[in-house]
């Protein structure tokens, strides 16, 4: 039939593995009159032949390393040898097999590396070549260090890039290599083809001798530089040196400062270029880089640390132009009025920033001077002599001297005398009633306004009201914001409400002042209010315990076996009904109540594993909301597929009469899983009666050779039955038939008078 093996003359491409003895024709070209024969030209290498009737074949094994692509041309000729069709290009792509071992270019390599070289930076390359195709695993090389000598504490100091053969230091090697301790190392390197992934890969080894040299590219000690230096700049502060002359040095400011006050010269000397200000920046960390003439870094950058030493060049500063404190009438002696906190930009916890406080003036001095005192080091103001009266003096102004060891600064404090806090906040309502909200009400929503009043002096800490929820909201779902002008409280939602955990909350508010109440006055029931928050249910879909459920069973489990289960819960506590969706193969059923999943048909790994279906959980009753999860059933292989021939072997032939016993190669396969080593088939003749004429011998786990035992065969077709056993558990056997024709040949092909197109043999032996 036309198609895979025969057809009209047209450009075509065929792929053939190298190294295989010919076992099949490549193609049968069909001629259209007046064409009667075909001509093959191009890169035939006397391997490719086209027989008069258009049978294209090859007569010996190909070698990809000799020629990876054979560019051929086929023309159809008439009976006078004149081209009547074509020529058309026929491309034979020779597919690679692993028939070449990798070879190192040198049996010994030598190199040197400096201690502390950057990890991962190659200092030596080993190189191997493999004639096989680098686009296939056969030519993909994998380098490995077999041994490092000496090996200290079982730590590898060297590493190799598996693909490029680049040898570099590991992090440990970069840190620990020391020529004083060990000046030389030896590595044995292996290279494997097949990307190093196959036990059938070829390999080679080489030896690498490595000398470790000293590294003077080291970070200098941290530098201390006094701020505001008046010496002429630039000033050399430290230095770095590369191991060899000719390096180009530069500094890298990782912080991207607007002003970077350091430079480096081409000797590696580092300078500060202008006076530093500790209060602007107290430490600098930057990097010194050494590059080669092409601008490529020679090694890792060195970290340079510069600490700026403080001098006392900053006076204390006041927190604000005037600091305001309040004090109630009749407050007792020693009560704290407030703390004045001044600042000094000089270095903390040093004499340069250690501050002293002293009151230098009080106005008015009524009823006397010295009413207040300030703690010398803490800055805390206290009532010193007597209680104050608002009607006599409602406001005092203090001038306070704040000093460090060299500078003095004056700060101003205003002390307002306010009413005593003898009035408590009183709620307008003690019960704000019930409020019903859906559980999905937005966060940030204001749900209630509350109001308390306080008769103390307005706009003082005695009359300011702060609201707190003291009961009924342990989860902190609510909060209260206060308007400072009106003391109105706005109750807002801070966290989502939840019907399932708190359907009803009895909330209690307390109203308080920031100022303490006077002695003898206490908050009472008037400062408390309540309200009841009722949260209504919003129906939510069931929730699966997992996004994906996974189970693993053998593909041969009995019908009705439980293969897995799923679980979901409904937030409202409704019952759940489970169902399956997407069970395209009809393999499974689910228990609607329990979520258990059972097989209802034979499973088959070869049809596809894992088998993916969706599970649906639906509320029973309510609004029948549902959610979906995945169930993945991983099928473990059992040996349930007998071996078979890997391809169609019709058209095998031997030329009659046989001049010597002949043989042909065939390949078997099966659809089961073959981990790691692949199939291990055994081959034998399918019936005893064949033993006189044929024998079958195993080549490897998948290929066998069928050979004739003698040469006395008739000119006809023989059907040879082959028994192939897969050696599995249980072992399965397939009986396959190989039809072999014995026919008269012309130039190695079955001869047929021209015009006869039936029964085309396709493989010559």
């Amino acid at each position: 039939q036309e198609g895979k093996f025969s057809g009209p003359l047209k450009p075509m491409t065929f792929s053939i593995y190298e190294g295989q003895e010919p076992s099949q024709i490549i193609f049968q070209f069909k001629a259209n009159p007046p064409a009667v024969t075909f001509e093959l030209t191009g890169e035939t290498d006397n391997i490719f032949v086209i027989e008069r009737e258009g049978l294209l074949y090859y007569n010996r094994a190909l070698d990809r390393e000799t020629r990876s692509t054979h560019n051929l041309q086929v023309a159809a000729l008439d009976a006078n040898g004149i081209i009547v069709e074509g020529p058309v290009p026929i491309t034979i792509k020779v597919k690679d097999i692993n028939d070449n071992r990798p070879t190192f270019l040198q049996s010994k390599y030598e190199g040197s590396v400096r201690q502390n070289s950057r990890p991962g930076k190659p200092f030596l390359y080993v190189n191997a070549t493999d004639l096989d195709d680098p686009a296939t695993p056969n030519g993909q090389l994998y380098y490995q260090i077999v041994i490092q000598l000496p090996m200290i504490n079982n730590v590898m100091y060297f590493q190799i890039n598996n693909k490029t053969g680049a040898i570099s230091l590991t992090r440990e090697g970069s840190q620990e290599l020391n020529p004083a301790k060990n000046p030389s190392y030896n590595l044995v390197i292996s290279v494997k083809d097949m990307g190093g992934q196959s036990e059938n890969s070829f390999s080679d080894t080489t030896s690498v001798d490595i000398i470790v040299t000293e590294n003077i590219w080291k970070a200098p000690k941290p530098v201390e530089m006094v701020e505001n230096s008046t010496d002429p700049h630039p000033i050399k502060i430290t230095q770095v040196r590369w191991n060899d002359p000719g390096a180009q040095y530069s500094l890298v400011d990782k912080e991207k400062l607007p002003r970077f006050p350091f430079s480096i010269d081409q000797e590696g000397d580092i300078y500060v270029t202008q006076p530093l200000d500790r209060e602007e920046k107290d430490a600098y960390v930057f990097y010194a880089v050494a590059k080669d003439e092409y601008g490529k870094p020679l090694s890792y950058p060195l970290e340079i640390h510069v600490k700026v030493k403080d001098i006392n060049d900053n006076p204390p500063t006041c927190p604000s132009p005037v600091t305001v404190f309040e004090v109630q009438e009749n407050e007792r002696l020693g009560n704290s009025i407030g703390t004045l906190t001044a600042h000094d930009r000089d270095e903390e916890n040093t004499a340069n920033s250690f501050l002293n406080y002293r009151i230098v003036e009080q106005t008015p001095k009524l009823p006397m001077d010295g009413l207040f005192l300030i703690q010398t080091y803490a800055g805390m103001l206290q009532l010193a002599k007597q209680s104050l009266k608002k009607q006599d003096t409602p406001q005092y102004n203090l001038t306070i001297e704040v000093s460090d060891k060299d500078f003095k600064t004056l700060c101003f404090v205003q002390i307002n005398v306010i009413d005593i806090n003898d009035q408590i906040p009183i709620f307008e309502k003690s019960d704000y009633g019930n409020l019903t909200l859906a559980e999905d009400t937005n966060i940030g929503s204001t749900i209630l306004t509350i109001q308390a009043t306080d008769a103390d002096e307005p706009f003082t800490g005695s009359s300011k009201i702060l609201y707190h929820i003291i009961k009924g909201d342990s989860e902190g779902r609510l909060g209260v914001d206060t308007d400072p002008h009106t003391n109105t409280g706005y109750v807002i939602i801070k966290k989502p409400l939840d019907f399932e955990t708190a359907a009803v909350s009895n909330i209690v508010f307390k109203a308080e002042n920031p100022e303490p109440l006077v002695f003898g006055v206490k908050y009472n029931a008037s400062s408390f209010a309540k309200f009841t928050l009722i949260v209504t249910d919003v129906n939510e879909a069931p929730q699966f315990s997992q996004h994906v459920f996974q189970a693993k069973v053998s593909e041969d489990v009995a019908i009705g076996t439980k293969v897995g289960n799923v679980t979901a819960k409904d937030p409202e506590g409704l019952d759940i009904s489970y169902s399956l969706r997407g069970d395209t193969r009809g393999w499974l059923k689910i228990d609607h109540v329990t979520g258990e999943i059972f097989s209802v048909a034979p499973l088959d790994r070869e049809a596809g594993s894992p088998y993916r279906v969706q599970v649906v959980a639906t509320e029973v009753g309510g609004s029948s909301l549902s959610s979906v999860s995945e169930f993945h059933l991983i099928l473990m292989d059992v040996n349930d597929n007998p071996p078979r021939l890997a391809k169609d072997y019709t058209g095998l032939f031997f030329c009659h009469p046989l001049s010597a016993p002949g043989s042909l190669i065939f390949e078997a396969t099966d659809d089961d899983q073959h981990l790691f080593r692949g199939p291990h088939f055994t081959f034998s003749l399918g019936s005893g009666s064949l033993q006189n004429d044929w024998e079958v011998s195993k080549i490897n786990g998948t290929h066998a050779r069928l050979s004739t035992r003698h040469t006395e065969f008739e000119e006809r077709e023989y059907v040879v039955l082959i028994r192939i056993n897969d050696g599995g558990r249980p072992p399965l056997e397939g009986i396959v038939s190989l039809p072999v024709t014995f026919c008269s040949c012309v130039e190695g092909s079955c001869f047929r008078p021209a015009g006869h197109q039936t029964g085309i043999p396709t493989v010559g032996m």
Partner: antibody, heavy 119, light 112 residues
């Protein structure tokens, strides 16, 4: 041995037809093509056409396409060339020749047939 | 059609001397298979033609080896290393790369 034997000389009047035969022997007649050429007095050779006896396929020189017919009888291994509407300038020696399949050259020629066209 | 041009048209030669006949085609006769489709034959007086050289340089069976053919895609030469009396006749070149087959005018070799 391989031989091509042509029919005898012919004298024809203008407007008539002539049919020259070429009998092959010593090989399988259907394996090779038979070509016809002519040589006019004192002139070079002209190719008339060929026939492939295996399937009867023919090809003609455009110049002779309308007047020449090539046929073959495989039972007698004989090829024929008929030329119609003869003119005086068709006077020539007509040759058949075997074109050797696979080697692609004229290896055997007939002895030639003289056709004279005269009123 | 491909035009074949021979020269000289007449060639008188002394026996024992070499002879050379040239043939030129209007199109290259070299095909991608490496073969050049040029044919040389001889027509002795009163005889039918007989093959000498096929595919430009191949000596036909039974032809004396004093005959040889050579050339490029369009320029061809037939050489006789030592002419003998029996070599007289008209020598033709012919192309069979494509239809119609075409012939040179012929070169008449005669003995001086």
């Amino acid at each position: 041995q391989v031989q091509l034997v042509q029919s005898g000389a012919e004298v024809k009047k203008p407007g008539a037809s002539v049919k020259v035969s070429c009998k092959a022997s010593g090989y399988t007649f259907t394996d090779h093509t038979i070509h016809w050429m002519r040589q006019r007095p004192g002139q070079g050779l002209e190719w008339i056409g060929y026939i492939y006896p295996r399937d009867g396929y023919t090809k003609y020189n455009e110049k002779f396409k309308d007047r020449a017919t090539l046929t073959a009888d495989t039972s007698t291994s004989t090829a024929y060339m008929e030329l119609r509407s003869l003119r005086s300038d068709d006077t020539a020696v007509y040759y058949c020749a075997r074109f050797y399949y696979g080697y692609w050259y004229f290896d055997v020629w007939g002895q030639g047939t003289t056709v004279t066209v005269s009123s | 059609d491909i035009v074949m041009t021979q020269s000289p048209l007449s060639l008188p030669v002394t026996p024992g001397e070499p002879a050379s006949i040239s043939c030129r085609s209007s199109k290259s006769l070299l095909r991608s298979n490496g073969n050049t489709y040029l044919y040389w034959f001889l027509q002795k007086p009163g005889q039918s033609p007989q093959v000498l050289i096929y595919r430009m340089s191949n000596l036909a069976s039974g032809v004396p080896d004093r005959f040889s053919g050579s050339g490029s895609g369009t320029d061809f030469t037939l050489k006789i290393s030592r002419v003998e009396a029996e070599d007289v006749g008209v020598y033709y070149c012919m192309q069979h790369l494509e239809y119609p087959f075409t012939f040179g005018q012929g070169t008449k070799l005669e003995i001086k």
